[in-house]
Structures are given as structure tokens and as C-alpha cells.
């Protein structure tokens, strides 16, 4: 069977991560957003810079907070079949991309962000890394 190159696999994982983050943002950032103002009280921390795969450590660090926000939405207005499983899948993808031995020390912005701002920023980061890879 043909095997895909490491670069191709990395791109596929990034595209999957991008898709997952977009699904989350669509679920949160629509009119239902107003229905769940409690979600907007959660603080998220954004990386000072994120241009390489190792910077995904900064995303992994925030997945626990993301899980807690999604827990609020269960049986309410935002329907994910299994939020815990969804976050778990994102975590697996992130580890595949950054490597499990990554000891990168994440530097965060001083200003925290809402969950909507957080997801938008990480979507943009993923898009930027993908576009760099495909050049």
C-alpha cells in the first residue's frame, strides 16, 4: 500500500485540527452565543507567537479550560455528541503534530481572551502554518 510522506501526514493532521476548531467556533459563535453568556466569562490565554508546530503546546495547555466551557453547553443550545471525546480527539491531533517529547515552554500574551477570540486566533494560526507548508 502506498505510504504518505511525513509532510503530507502533518498537513492532514493540521487540516483536521483546523476543521475541529472551526466546528467548535461555529457552535459557539452564532446567535446561541448570546444564549450562553457564561461561556464568555471564561479566560483563555493566547500565545505571544505561534508560527511553528512546537507552539501547539500553547493550545494543548488551554484544552482543559476549553473542556470546561463545553461542559456548560451540554444539554443546552450547543449540540456536540460528546464534548469530552471531541476535546480528546483535538488533544491527540495536537500531540501528533507537536510531538509528545516537546518540552517547549509556552509564552502567553498578558491579555486574556474569550473563548470566541481564542478559537478565532488558533484557526488563523493553523491556516497560517498550513499555508507556509504548501508554499
Amino acid at each position: 500500500a502506498p505510504t504518505s510522506s511525513p509532510a503530507k501526514e502533518t498537513q492532514q493532521h493540521l487540516e483536521q485540527l483546523l476543521l475541529d476548531l472551526q466546528v467548535l467556533l461555529r457552535g459557539i459563535d452564532n446567535y446561541k452565543n448570546l444564549k450562553l453568556p457564561m461561556m464568555l466569562t471564561f479566560k483563555f490565554y493566547l500565545p505571544k507567537q505561534a508560527t511553528e508546530l512546537k507552539h501547539l503546546q500553547c493550545l494543548e495547555n488551554e484544552l482543559g479550560a476549553l473542556q470546561r466551557v463545553l461542559d456548560l453547553t451540554q444539554s443546552k443550545s450547543f449540540h456536540l455528541e460528546d464534548a469530552g471525546n471531541f476535546i480528546s480527539n483535538i488533544r491527540v491531533t495536537v500531540v501528533k503534530l507537536k510531538g509528545s517529547e516537546n518540552k517547549f515552554e509556552c509564552q502567553f500574551d498578558d491579555e486574556p481572551a474569550t473563548v470566541v477570540e481564542f478559537l478565532r486566533r488558533w484557526i488563523a494560526i493553523c491556516q497560517s502554518i498550513i499555508s507556509t507548508m504548501t508554499q
Epitope: Y31, N33, L34, K35, P37, M38, L40, T41, F42, K43, A65, R68, L72, E111, P112, T114
Partner: antibody, heavy 117, light 108 residues
Amino acid sequence: EVQLVQSGTEVKKAGDSLKISCKGSGYNFDTYWIGWVRQMPGRGLEWMGTIYPADSDTRYSPSFQGQVTMSADKSISTAYLQWGSLRASDTAMYYCARFSSSAYDIWGQGTMVTVSS
Amino acid sequence: SYELTQPPSVSVSPGQTARITCSGDALPRKFAYWYQQKSGQAPVLVIYQDTKRPSGIPERFSGSSSGTTVTLTISDVQAEDDADYYCQSADRSDSYVFGAGTKLTVLG
């Protein structure tokens, strides 16, 4: 102009029922939570709970669960706070406030409720 | 139940800087909001999401956050700033909570 206008001062006896109102104007009343806040004489603010007028979804503070009932009539852009049986300890100023995506950004002028025993 | 802790009172002379703190275990992960309440009036939002100022609020009002403490800073304090100030945040459940309030007295 975005505003919330509350019903007037109420003087009641212990055991009476009461329903106070909060009418919104200048914005889409349906799609913003309306919170209720109690302020007893000389005391601080206490969050009582909140209601989403579009479908009357409500969340109560544990301290007020079962003590009051929140409701809304979206057709007339009005939220309500009611008591089945008032007590002297319900004497307070009651504020309604709109929760935008950031905070309680618009407040009513308050309704003073006095309950004599 | 979850509590936000504020000092009962702060006094400052006109033109000076007033700092009002609010502490709570959840504040590293929950935004804080600040309200001003003048005597006999409804509260007014002065700071949201720790540091943001609504339109119409003077630049003298600012907010900051560090760990479990958020701070409302009022620089060049004016007589009209004499009021009660309340911090508000959310607890770990689906509930909001206010601090007990701080009375800011502008001396003189």
C-alpha cells in the same frame, strides 16, 4: 435609546403575592438575558438569577431558587419577578439588568419593595 | 459558596489614585466586571472583562488582573467618583456573584 424601565414602588404585607416588571426598549429584547439583582437596605448587590426572553430559559442563584419566579413575555418585551408569599426579609430594591456579551451593561432604575409584618 | 473579597472602604484625596482590589479563587480563569453605584442610583458598568472600558466611561478608570486578584484603578480621582464599587464574576457553576462592595470616599 436602549433602556429598561421598571414598575413602581410596592408596599405590601407579609404573605401577599407580588409581581414586578421590567420593560426593555431600543434593542432586540428576545436575545439578551435579563438578570435580577437584589439590594437590601444599606447592603450590597446580590445576583438572584436570569432569564432568556426568547424561550424563557431561566437560571437561579441557589440562594433564591424556590423563593422567587422569573418569567418573560417577549411579545411586550417585558420580564417579571414574582413572589407567591412575601416576607419582611424581602424588603429591598430590585434591579433588572441586561446581560450583553460582556456584562450587565444596561440597568433598570430599580423597584423598591417594602414588606411590613 | 464562592466569594469575591473586597476591602470595605478606601479613602483618597481629589487628584490622587484609588485602587480597589477584588480576590477570588476562580479569577485566574474567570473575567471580572466592575460596577459603580452612586447613592440612590442604579449601578453602572465601568470595567468589563478585567481591563476593558465601556464607551462613555472616563479613561481615568482602568482594570488589571494578576492571579487571583483583580484591581480597579481610578487615577486623578474626582469628587463625583465618591460611590460604592462592586466587582462581579462567575463561580465554577452556572452562577454569577458580586463582591460585598467597597465604599470609595473622596476626602475634602
